[in-house]
């Protein structure tokens, strides 16, 4: 799996999970989230050569096409596979609200 | 939807469905498929700016992060959303075989 256990341990040009910490105020200009101040969002990036974690038959065919025709601009892309939610605390007036935002943290990647 | 009806009608730099016809013999070097000789595989490509068909909360956050921090290398990617199968005819010896290959044709795209 192209997850932290594999990707953060290996030097990898190919599609893999990359660490990304987002500070809500500094990086997004958000002041409305009280806690946490930021989170490990992570992201997916890297090349998708033949058979590198192909998600569908189309991505397998496309990576084969791209290998045989390297001048072609059509190739699969490295995107999130498994995502997890993030629990945040914010205020409406003086009333605290706890909310779980779905699909906020990338845990693994794939070529799609 | 970023499908043929929209994407093939509009000149679009952003994430959209792109036409791609794959000739099995010429483009993949395959002689084993008897029919069809090729097919409209299509592919997804283009930029994923803020709110352009974001697939998840993470991709929305990432596109916002990328807008505010344009020097960052983290951004969503344009990938297939809806896929359809392709029915092929091939031979094993002199015996014809019909098989449906799932997820071979891209019908629409998303930023993920």
């Amino acid at each position: 799996a192209l997850d932290a256990a594999y990707c953060f341990r290996n030097v990898q040009d190919n599609c893999c999970l990359r660490p990304l910490y987002i500070d809500f105020k500094r990086d997004l200009g958000w002041k409305w989230i009280h806690e946490p101040k930021g989170y490990n969002a992570n992201f997916c990036a890297g090349a998708c050569p033949y058979l590198w974690s192909s998600d569908t038959q189309h991505s397998r065919v496309l990576s084969l096409y791209n290998t045989i025709n390297p001048e072609a601009s059509a190739s699969p892309c490295c995107v999130s596979q498994d995502l997890e939610p993030l629990t945040i605390l914010y205020y409406i007036g003086k009333t605290p609200k706890i909310e779980q935002l779905s699909n906020m943290i990338v845990k693994s990647c794939k070529c799609s | 939807a970023l499908d043929a009806a929209y994407c093939f009608r509009n000149v679009q730099d952003n994430c959209c469905l792109r036409p791609l016809y794959i000739d099995f013999k010429r483009d993949l070097g395959w002689k084993w498929i008897h029919e069809p000789k090729g097919y409209n595989a299509n592919f997804c490509a283009g930029a994923c700016p803020y709110l352009w068909s974001s697939d998840t909360q993470h991709s929305r956050v990432l596109s916002l992060y990328n807008t505010i921090n344009p020097e960052a290398s983290a951004s969503p990617c344009c990938v297939s959303q809806d896929l359809e199968p392709l029915t092929i005819l091939y031979y094993i010896g002199k015996t014809p075989k019909i098989e449906q290959l799932s997820n071979m044709i891209v019908k629409s795209c998303k930023c993920s």
Epitope: - | L28, G29, K31, E99, L101, S102
Partner: nanobody, 120 residues
Amino acid sequence: QLQLVESGGGLVQPGGSLRLSCTASGSTFEIYPIYAMAWFRQTPGKQRELVALTTDVKTNYADSVKGRFTISRDNAKNTVYLQMNMLQPEDTAVYVCNVGVVRGGLQNYWGQGTQVTVSS
């Protein structure tokens, strides 16, 4: 039971040659079409690299091996070969073969790998 068996690896001096073989056994390879055969190589701590690939009428090579390596296949023997000439120390790796078979979709099978060491 479907199996890929590689052979031909070993220790060779720089400038030397080796011929790797990968034979596919098991009924799957006799019953279903093969859509691609390929050789990859893996070195510790580095990513798996596609070395050479062949389909029915197309071949492709990594830039680093072009002009030195040749991939070929013998359909009757269900075997794919990798002829490696002018070997260099940077070619040292575990070489793994992969066979793509059309079996309820595009399925891929991996061998166990064979070690190639180029050293004087």
